[in-house]
Interface confidence: low
């Protein structure tokens, strides 16, 4: 079924900034998506089209993006009457009227929002759940439920506290099945809430951008402190392992790492890419981490190459790849890191991002399936993760409707899928492999 | 290539049970879900029901409840489905059948195994 | 249950005849429809799938078409490999069931 009409529209992020969203028309209805934007931003990744209009939303805006949808996108796509099943050649046709090679022209936001949208119709049209079209657009066989990886402490960019790392996660990869990890997930949240309450007081406990605590630590081993504390007291310290995102671009001076950038700049107390893989070889020995994300800057390739050969754990490129085929190729020939952390924003398609992925996959990468931390209701990524059996998500903490969206809707996955689930469990890195 | 090869013909009592082995090779015998599809003598097919190797969930045809179990063994990669108080009607040749890209849709079968119930 | 009734039953044609036969459920199935080609003596094959994706390896002179109740399987030019029964088949939930088939013979 082709598509009839095509209307995009300014709305809110989780943040309160403006964002993309898009309805799109076939005769079995209406499609809605809404997409995603970083609090930091890769700078290799496509170009999220903003008014930079100052009088209007700080700058943010995105009417301009709205206006290529309903001005130029729309009218292209109704007219060419290609069916919605038909995901890569609308991408494709998107992709090429942009002309751009990082979507500038009419923006990743905006390619991206009638990419999903076209993607949700073309699961109605067939008769199948969205996880289940887009396994078939991935050329999947089957389906598998992730493991959750909770992003429970705040740091880096994203939080007001001392502490440099960005995130620090729990995977309830124990479990056995989602709604297991779920509630796992969940009691270990809560647990965390009171021991950061019974240490630094009521106020720790306020959330952040994506649900988490940002209690006022500055020792990012006091983090993981907090954690092992809280997944003991509730009960799971064999079920549950702990993945980190350090974001480490953001604290990245001239070839050294400040892990104190939130203070007064001190180029005395830098440390080298070898000290600061020390220091996470020692959190691997000390504690249960398993996942350690963007460890190093997005261009210290030599730093990457060296740590993920000797660490023995997951080593997610998020910064460094940033969904980019190019430098997901390049990252692979320098095996700098072993997964793939998917965000479809980043590349702005999703054809692009299921490319991604398979190639990722194809080179015997993990891949995890990631939110933003400006998010709206979409539960796409929960689907997308689904069908595309990478067997690991990280969409905030259990807390937080626009993270929540996501859990509630993989929860509902599996129960359609009954005793059809599969749950990637301790298989997380390579569900597929039995 | 993807087999499934299944044990020999049967002929059973009245209110005996049997047991049919179905042999995976070719695939990841955990990744997909296998059913099994009954079909009596110039008759058309019945679907019995199903089980996921990955986690032994199963689901039966209601018609079969209580008599059937299926079962897997993954180390030899092998399904099972065993059926329980024999009538003459179960007289029929038995299928396992893999489940392919959509649920539901069987892109494997076995070559089938008469049983045949007679006193 | 959701019942499949297929029509004919039984169907007599020629090598290169257009052959069509249909399918129809009880209840809206969307597009949670299989076809299967069953010879004498062996396991059924599968032949469309989602109602009208073709599996590799199938010959294109088949194609399949519908949606919700009503079905079609068709077979532009017939050949002699081609003379077998015929049977859709819903996966709209469990329990999954079959038509009674539709047996093509030559004429």
């Known amino acids: 079924m082709s598509i009839l009409k095509i209307h995009a529209r300014e709305i809110f992020d989780s943040r309160g900034n403006p964002t993309v969203e898009v309805d799109l028309f076939t005769s079995k209805g209406l499609f809605r998506a809404a997409v995603p934007s970083g609090a930091s931003t890769g700078i290799y990744e496509a170009l999220e089209l903003r008014d930079n209009d100052k009088t209007r939303y700080m700058g943010k805006g995105v009417s301009k993006a709205v206006e290529h949808i309903n001005k130029t996108i729309a009218p292209a796509l109704v007219s060419k009457k290609l069916n919605v099943t038909e995901q890569e050649k609308i991408d494709k046709l998107m992709i090429e009227m942009d002309g751009t090679e990082n979507k500038s022209k009419f923006g990743a936001n905006a390619i991206l929002g009638v990419s999903l949208a076209v993607c949700k119709a073309g699961a109605v049209e067939k008769g199948v759940p969205l996880y289940r079209h887009i396994a078939d657009l991935a050329g999947n066989s089957e389906v598998i439920l992730p493991v959750p990886a909770f992003n429970v402490i705040n740091g880096g960019s994203h939080a007001g506290n001392k502490l440099a790392m960005q995130e620090f996660m729990i995977l309830p990869v124990g479990a056995a099945n989602f709604r297991e990890a779920m509630r796992i997930g969940a009691e270990v949240y809560h647990n965390l809430k009171n021991v950061i309450k019974e240490k630094y007081g009521k106020d720790a406990t306020n959330v952040g951008d994506e649900g988490g605590f940002a209690p006022n630590i500055l020792e990012n081993k006091e983090g993981l402190e907090l954690l092992k504390t809280a997944i003991g007291k509730a009960g799971y310290t064999d079920k549950v392992v702990i993945g980190m995102d350090v974001a480490a671009s953001e604290f990245f001076r001239s070839g050294k790492y400040d892990l104190d950038f939130k203070s007064p700049d001190d180029p005395s107390r830098y440390i080298s890419p070898d000290q600061l893989a020390d220091l996470y070889k020692s959190f691997i020995k000390d504690y249960p981490v398993v996942s350690i994300e963007d460890p190093f800057d997005a261009d210290d390739w030599g730093a990457w190459q060296k740590f993920t050969a000797s660490a023995g754990i997951q080593v997610v490129g998020d910064d460094l790849t940033v969904t980019n085929p190019k430098r997901i190729a390049k990252a692979v020939n320098e095996k700098s890191c072993n997964c793939l952390l998917l965000k479809v924003n980043q590349i702005g398609s999703v054809t692009e991002s299921l490319q991604a992925c398979k190639l990722a996959q194809a080179n015997g990468w993990g891949v995890m399936v990631s939110h933003r931390s400006g998010e709206t209701e979409d539960t796409f990524i929960a689907d997308l993760v689904v069908g595309l059996c990478t067997g690991q998500i990280k969409t905030g903490a259990p807390c937080r409707s626009e993270r929540l969206a996501k859990y509630n809707q993989l929860l509902r996955i599996e129960e359609e899928l009954g005793s059809k689930a599969k749950f990637a469990g301790r298989n997380f890195r390579n569900p597929l492999a039995k | 290539q993807v087999q499934l090869v299944q044990s020999g013909a049967e002929v059973k009592k009245p209110g005996a049970s049997v047991k049919v082995s179905c042999k995976a090779s070719?695939?990841?015998?955990?990744?997909?879900?296998m059913n099994w599809v009954r079909q009596a003598p110039g008759q058309g097919l019945e679907w019995m029901g199903y089980?996921?190797?990955?986690?032994?969930?199963?689901k039966y045809n209601e018609k079969f409840k209580g008599r059937v179990t299926m079962t897997t063994d993954t180390s030899t990669s092998t399904a099972y489905m065993e059926l329980r108080s024999l009538r003459s009607d179960d007289t029929a040749v038995y299928y396992c059948?893999?489940?392919?890209?959509?649920?539901?849709?069987?892109?494997?079968w076995g070559q089938g195994t008469l049983v045949t119930v007679s006193s | 249950d959701i019942q499949m009734t297929q029509s004919p039953s039984s169907l007599s044609a020629s090598v290169g005849d257009r052959v069509t036969i249909t399918c129809r459920a009880s209840?809206?199935?969307?597009?949670?429809l299989t076809w299967y080609q069953q010879k004498p003596g062996k396991a059924p094959k599968l032949l469309i799938y989602?109602?009208?994706t073709l599996p590799e390896g199938v010959p294109s002179r088949f194609s399949g078409s519908g949606s919700g109740t009503d079905f079609t399987l068709t077979i532009s030019s017939l050949q002699p490999e081609d003379f077998a029964t015929y049977y859709c088949?819903?996966?709209?939930?469990?329990?999954?069931?079959f038509g009674q088939g539709t047996k093509l013979e030559i004429k």
């Open positions: 209840e809206n199935i969307y597009s949670y």
């Open positions: 059948a893999r489940e392919g890209f959509y649920y539901g849709n069987f892109d494997n």
């Open positions: 089980i996921n190797p990955y986690n032994d969930g199963t």
């Open positions: 088949q819903h996966h709209y939930g469990t329990p999954y069931t």
């Open positions: 989602n109602a009208k």
């Open positions: 070719g695939y990841t015998f955990t990744s997909s879900v």
